[in-house]
């Protein structure tokens, strides 16, 4: 679609005569008829296939035609066409004399023709005017012409329709050839696809407007290149969505079970050596001079009662010293100068001679101890209670008060919440310090594996075209991550299928 424009500039008819040679009375009141048609090697009469246009009376005899495009559009003359411009044409311009006001062909005498010119040739679409001048015996016509495309039509022959737009069906302007030129931030055949934030992950991110990066399920971060770990994952990471790969020293489904209590909590005090002995369990090996579960208590060297035979112990900066009772000597008062004759055994202890009477030994009754049965038995001295249990003397006996999670005479047994098999449907039970945890088999969930759920949504390989399947364990659904060139919830459709219609 376009317009052939003809600009009449000057007509010269100095003698004021008709084509027949007869003069006009009083002068030649001149108007023009224009016929535009397809190319003919020899321009002949016939239908004006590209259009016709007539002017009003423009002047008498000789005159210049002023540009009147602003005042009614009569000059240049407009010959619109609604087809592809062929690049060639034939043009007939007739100058007529109008004796009266009626300019219709049938109202004019046949000899009212002043002059007729016919041209033909090639003409490309363009903004530039072609200037021409045609001279006959008595007249001269100067004019120019061009072909331009109608609004929204482009290309060498005005055949390409293009309308700039800026809505969700396209964001573009039109180039001179009719091709689309996308506005900044947009791409695609119709410029309807936004250019996402630079670096936005090609598969895991998308956008609805330029410089945006929205993440697909399972991904996060400014560029959607960080996977989202399993919901509840504490000390773990992921390489694909919904994973929970435990950091060193952590275990369990959610990586919340401490396998390296020593490193994470440093419970042993006073330079003691810490050894991991299970989940949230540890043992401290104390340096000399310290005691307690965490070696938190400073030990007096006299606390171990190193002095025998009733010797009394005195703490010193560099150790201890035993003050021996009469009849005894040695570092720990372990040597005796007494014999059974001296009745050295107290509390009903019986004396036995040794080394031909040079020495003796006391056999103590129950609840007494020491070389001379001089000490009442403290059954807690040997720290018999394990796992931090507290030892209590109860007359002739003793008992251990255990920390939570331990039992047995010496607190040597873990209390097992798993003993009563609390996990249903074959779930695996794990003892924790403050309870238990069930690891459920596929198809079951809940604190005790009591809820029947669907099996792994990815187990049936629902994704097509080599797409990666992710199971969202929190919703028991799957997400297909499509390779480039495929779309759809299962990546089953190639991008850009040609449109089809219902007719």
């Amino acid at each position: 679609s376009g317009v052939f424009q003809l600009q009449l500039q000057e007509f010269i008819n100095e003698r004021g005569v008709l084509a027949s040679g007869r003069p006009c009375e009083p002068g030649c009141r001149t108007f023009f008829r224009v016929c535009l048609k397809h190319f003919q090697a020899v321009v002949s009469p016939g239908p004006c296939t590209f259009g016709t246009v007539s002017t009003p009376v423009l002047g008498t005899n000789s005159f210049a035609v002023r540009d009147d495009s602003s005042g009614g559009g009569r000059n240049p003359l407009q010959l619109p066409f609604n087809f592809t411009w062929p690049g060639t044409f034939s043009l007939i311009i007739e100058a007529w004399h109008a004796p009266g006001d009626d300019l219709r062909p049938e109202a004019l005498p046949p000899d009212a023709l002043i002059s007729k010119i016919a041209i033909q040739g090639s003409l490309a679409v363009g903004q530039n005017w072609l200037l021409d001048e045609q001279t006959s015996t008595l007249t001269r016509l100067r004019y120019s012409y061009r072909v331009i495309c109608s609004d929204n039509y482009y290309g060498d022959n005005c055949s390409r329709l293009c309308k700039k737009r800026n809505d969700h069906f396209g964001h573009y302007v039109c180039q001179p050839d009719g091709n689309l030129s996308c506005l900044p931030g947009w791409t695609g055949e119709y410029c309807q696809q936004p250019i996402c934030l630079s670096g936005c992950h090609e598969q895991n991110g998308y956008c609805s407007k330029p410089a945006e990066c929205l993440c697909r399920p399972g991904w996060q971060g400014r560029l959607c290149n960080e996977c989202i770990p399993h919901n509840g994952c504490r000390h773990g990471t992921c390489s694909t969505p919904w994973q929970c790969t435990c950091d060193e020293g952590w275990g369990g489904l959610f990586c919340d079970q401490d396998l390296n209590y020593c490193t994470h909590h440093s419970p042993c005090k006073n330079g003691a050596t810490c050894s991991n002995s299970g989940q949230r369990s540890y043992t401290c090996t104390c340096r000399p001079g310290y005691t307690g579960v965490d070696c938190e208590l400073e030990l007096s060297e006299c606390d171990s009662n190193p002095c025998r035979n009733g010797g009394s112990c005195k703490d010193q900066e560099d150790g201890y010293h035993c003050l021996c009772p009469p009849g005894y000597y040695g570092l720990h008062c372990e040597h005796s100068t007494l014999s059974c004759a001296d009745s050295p055994c107290f509390n009903g202890g019986s004396c036995r001679e040794r080394n031909q009477g040079a020495n003796y030994a006391c056999e103590c009754p129950p609840n007494f101890t020491g070389s001379n049965c001089e000490k009442k038995v403290d059954r807690c001295t040997s720290n018999p209670c394990a796992n931090g249990g507290q030892c209590l003397n109860r007359g002739p006996s003793r008992m251990c008060r255990c920390r939570p999670g331990f039992t047995g005479t010496y607190c040597e047994l873990h209390v097992s919440d798993c003993a009563r098999n609390p996990c249903a449907h074959g779930g695996t039970c794990h003892d924790l310090e403050n309870g238990l945890m069930c690891t459920c088999p596929a198809g079951f969930s809940g604190r005790r594996c009591e809820v029947r759920t669907s099996i792994d949504a990815c187990a049936s390989s629902p994704c097509f075209n080599r797409a990666t399947c992710y199971t969202d364990l929190s919703t028991d659904t799957f997400v297909c991550n499509c390779p480039y060139g495929f779309v759809g919830s299962r990546c089953e459709f190639p991008v850009g299928l040609p449109p089809s219609f219902p007719w």
């Epitope: 609805s208 779309v487 449109p499």
Partner: antibody, heavy 121, light 106 residues
Framework: EVQLQESGPGLVKPSETLSLTCTVS??????????WGWIRQPPGKGLEWIGD???????YYNPSLKSRVTISVDTSKNQFSLKLSSVTAADTAVYYC?????????????WGQGTLVTVSS | SYELTQPPSVSVSPGQTASITCSGQ??????VSWYQQKPGQSPVLVIY???KRPSGIPERFSGSNSGDTATLTISGTQPMDEADYYC?????????FGSGTKVTVL
């Protein structure tokens, strides 16, 4: 061949929310060449565009209905949905879902058969 | 808001040409689609991008659009063409339908 099918209640009480779903078969709702729209037609009257949605979730609404309309998409089910809140008798109409083609400069080449929703107590 | 105006009705004799106009401000700068709707049926796209016909639409349907007016022309109208016709254009991100024209084949 692509087919669209509207579904939802045919009767809604005034002040309640109208909810319709359009199920697409024979083609993917996730194609980059299409938007998915809702159009309605009150009895004996003309067509009124309600809004549309892209597979990514981008939505566009008729300003006259924007405060009451929500359109959503579920690519895994190949469906898109319309919710219109605070309905009155003036919302009684046949509701159509349609495919708007980018290549056709926004022309709707496939339509559902339409579902009549009556707002009445 | 943008409006598209159509005549309420157009009558035409069989075999004659029916022209339906659609007017809107600078409509020639927008792409126009035309839909045919028969009673009790869904609309059918008959013209898109001003003048293009989808496959399956008869050649007697043609369209043009310039200035403020788009026109749907049915040449050699047949009784089966009796229906309501709607023009449609996009104003920014909003779809706009014309008021509709009832074509009666006498």
């Amino acid at each position: 061949e692509v087919q669209l099918q509207e579904s939802g209640p045919g009767l809604v009480k005034p002040s309640e929310t109208l909810s319709l779903t359009c199920t697409v078969s024979g083609g993917s709702i996730s194609s980059s060449s299409y938007y998915w729209g809702w159009i309605r037609q009150p009895p004996g009257k003309g067509l009124e565009w309600i809004g549309d949605i892209y597979y990514t979730g981008s939505t566009y609404y008729n300003p006259s209905l924007k405060s009451r309309v929500t359109i959503s998409v579920d690519t895994s089910k190949n469906q898109f949905s319309l919710k219109l809140s605070s309905v009155t008798a003036a919302d009684t109409a046949v509701y159509y879902c349609a495919r708007e083609d980018v290549i056709l400069r926004g022309g709707s080449d496939y339509w559902g058969q339409g579902t009549l929703v009556t707002v009445s107590s | 808001s943008y409006e598209l105006t159509q005549p309420p009705s157009v009558s035409v004799s069989p075999g004659q040409t029916a022209s339906i106009t659609c007017s809107g401000q600078r409509l020639g700068d927008k792409y126009v689609s035309w839909y045919q709707q028969k009673p009790g049926q869904s609309p059918v796209l008959v013209i898109y991008e001003d003048s293009k016909r989808p496959s399956g639409i008869p050649e007697r349907f043609s369209g043009s659009n310039s200035g403020d007016t788009a026109t749907l022309t049915i040449s050699g109208t047949q009784p089966m063409d009796e229906a309501d016709y709607y023009c449609q254009a996009w104003d920014r991100d909003v779809g706009v339908f014309g008021s509709g024209t009832k074509v009666t084949v006498l």
